[in-house]
C-alpha cells in the first residue's frame, strides 16, 4: 500500500477519506487505527457502528469521528481540533472477524496555524530518515465553524 498524506492546520478539523470497493467489503465494519512504530501494531482509535446498516452514523472517540458510506464505498474520518500529537501514520481498515484488511495507509501532517504566532517548533513533520517516497499528498485543510454559523441547513 502506498501512503497518502493528509495535511491539516493545528486547531482546525481534518477530514481523511478512504475509498474502497463496496462490493468486496460488503457487510464489513471499518476502523481507523494508529500505527505504533514502523513495524508495530496498529492501535484501534475508532470503529464504525456494530450494526453494518448503521455504519453511516458518526461514531466518536474523543476528538476522532468515523462514518462509512457503504454504498459509495468511502470511509471518512474526522480529526477535530487537530493537535501536533495527532501527526503520524494511520490506517483505514476493513474488519472481518480477526482479520483486518488495510484500505489505505495515511500519514497525517499537522501544519502551523498561520494566524497563530506561537512557536511552531513542536509541530511534527516526517523527518528525512522516514521514507514516504510513494506518498500521495491530499491537502485537506479545513476550518472550524465560525461563531453563529449553522452546521446543518435549516429544515423547512
Amino acid at each position: 500500500h502506498n501512503t497518502t498524506v493528509f495535511q491539516g492546520v493545528a486547531g482546525q478539523s481534518l477530514q481523511v477519506s478512504c475509498p474502497y470497493d463496496s462490493m468486496k467489503h460488503w457487510g464489513r465494519r471499518k476502523a481507523w487505527c494508529r500505527q505504533l512504530g514502523e513495524k508495530g501494531p496498529c492501535q484501534r482509535v475508532v470503529s464504525t457502528h456494530n450494526l453494518w446498516l448503521l455504519s453511516f452514523l458518526r461514531r466518536w472517540n474523543g476528538s476522532t469521528a468515523i462514518t462509512d458510506d457503504t454504498l459509495g464505498g468511502t470511509l471518512t474520518i474526522t480529526l477535530r481540533n487537530l493537535q501536533p500529537h495527532d501527526a503520524g501514520l494511520y490506517q483505514c481498515q476493513s474488519l472481518h472477524g480477526s482479520e483486518a484488511d488495510t484500505l489505505r495507509k495515511v500519514l497525517v501532517e499537522v501544519l502551523a496555524d498561520p494566524l497563530d504566532h506561537r512557536d511552531a517548533g513542536d509541530l511534527w513533520f516526517p523527518g528525512e530518515s522516514e521514507s514516504f517516497e510513494d506518498a500521495h499528498v491530499e491537502h485537506s485543510i479545513s476550518r472550524s465553524l465560525l461563531e453563529g454559523e449553522i452546521p446543518f441547513p435549516p429544515t423547512s
Epitope: D21, M23, K24, W26, G27, W52, L53, T70, G97, S98
Partner: antibody, heavy 122, light 106 residues
Framework: EVQLVQSGAEVKKPGESLKISCKGS????????IGWVRQMPGKGLEWMGI????????RYSPSFQGQVTISADKSISTAYLQWSSLKASDTAMYYC???????????????WGQGTMVTVSS | EIVMTQSPATLSVSPGERATLSCRAS??????LAWYQQKPGQAPRLLIY???TRATGIPARFSGSGSGTEFTLTISSLQSEDFAVYYC????????FGGGTKVEIK
C-alpha cells in the same frame, strides 16, 4: 440465469498436479467472492478458501493454507482450485460457491456449482 | 478459527412433525449464520442467511433463530422432500461449517 459451472470429474495418481475450474455467468463475476468447499466421501462440508476475482485477493482456511492454491481469471469469469502434488486423502467432491450479499449486510453462499469429483488413487 | 457444533447428528422425525436442529458457535458470530440443505448427489442449497432470513424460494415452514453462539433451524411440518442433511455455517470470521444434522424418516 446466474450459475456456476464446474469442470468435469478427474482421476489422478498420487503426486500428480491438478487444476479444476469454476465458470460464472449471468452476473458480474468480478464483484462477488467465490469460495471453495470440500466434501470427502460420506462426510460434511469444509470451507477451503475464498477469492475476490476483482483483484484476486485470496483467503484460506488454516486447514488448507499451503495445501492448495486458489486463483481466478476475471477475463474469462473463471475461478480455479489447484494442487501441486495430490494425495489419496484429497479424494473428495469439490464445490465452488458464490458469496451472495443482501441489503442487511448479510452474506452467504447463495449459488453453488454442481461439484467436481476428484479421485486420487494409485 | 471458530468451531461450529451441530446437534443432534441424526434426527428421526415422522412426516408432518416438527424438527428442531441446533447449532452452536465456539464464540459469538453475532447474526452471521446461514443454514444449508443438502440432498444425496446434489450441491448444498441456501435456506437461511443472517440467522433468520429465508433465502429466495424457500418455503415458510423453514425458520431460523438465534444470535451470538446459539442458533436453531426449525422445520414446522416436515414434508417428504425435507429429509436431507442440514448444515449451519458462520461467516463472522472465515466461513466454517458445522458437522451437519441428518434428518431421516422415523
Amino acid at each position: 440465469e446466474v450459475q456456476l459451472v464446474q469442470s468435469g470429474a478427474e482421476v489422478k495418481k498420487p503426486g500428480e498436479s491438478l487444476k479444476i475450474s469454476c465458470k460464472g455467468s449471468g452476473y458480474s463475476f468480478t464483484s462477488y467472492w467465490i469460495g471453495w468447499v470440500r466434501q470427502m466421501p460420506g462426510k460434511g462440508l469444509e470451507w477451503m478458501g475464498i477469492i475476490y476475482p476483482g483483484d484476486s485477493d485470496t483467503r484460506y482456511s488454516p486447514s488448507f493454507q499451503g495445501q492448495v492454491t486458489i486463483s481466478a481469471d476475471k477475463s474469462i469469469s473463471t475461478a480455479y482450485l489447484q494442487w501441486s502434488s495430490l494425495k489419496a486423502s484429497d479424494t473428495a467432491m469439490y464445490y465452488c460457491a458464490r458469496l451472495g450479499r443482501w441489503s442487511s449486510g448479510s452474506t452467504a453462499f447463495d449459488i453453488w456449482g454442481q461439484g467436481t469429483m476428484v479421485t486420487v488413487s494409485s | 478459527e471458530i468451531v461450529m457444533t451441530q446437534s443432534p447428528a441424526t434426527l428421526s422425525v415422522s412426516p408432518g412433525e416438527r424438527a428442531t436442529l441446533s447449532c452452536r458457535a465456539s464464540q459469538s458470530v453475532s447474526s452471521n449464520l446461514a443454514w444449508y440443505q443438502q440432498k444425496p448427489g446434489q450441491a448444498p442449497r441456501l435456506l437461511i442467511y443472517g440467522a433468520s432470513t429465508r433465502a429466495t424460494g424457500i418455503p415458510a415452514r423453514f425458520s431460523g433463530s438465534g444470535s451470538g453462539t446459539e442458533f436453531t433451524l426449525t422445520i414446522s411440518s416436515l414434508q417428504s422432500e425435507d429429509f436431507a442433511v442440514y448444515y449451519c455455517q458462520q461467516d463472522d470470521d472465515g466461513y466454517t461449517f458445522g458437522g451437519g444434522t441428518k434428518v431421516e424418516i422415523k
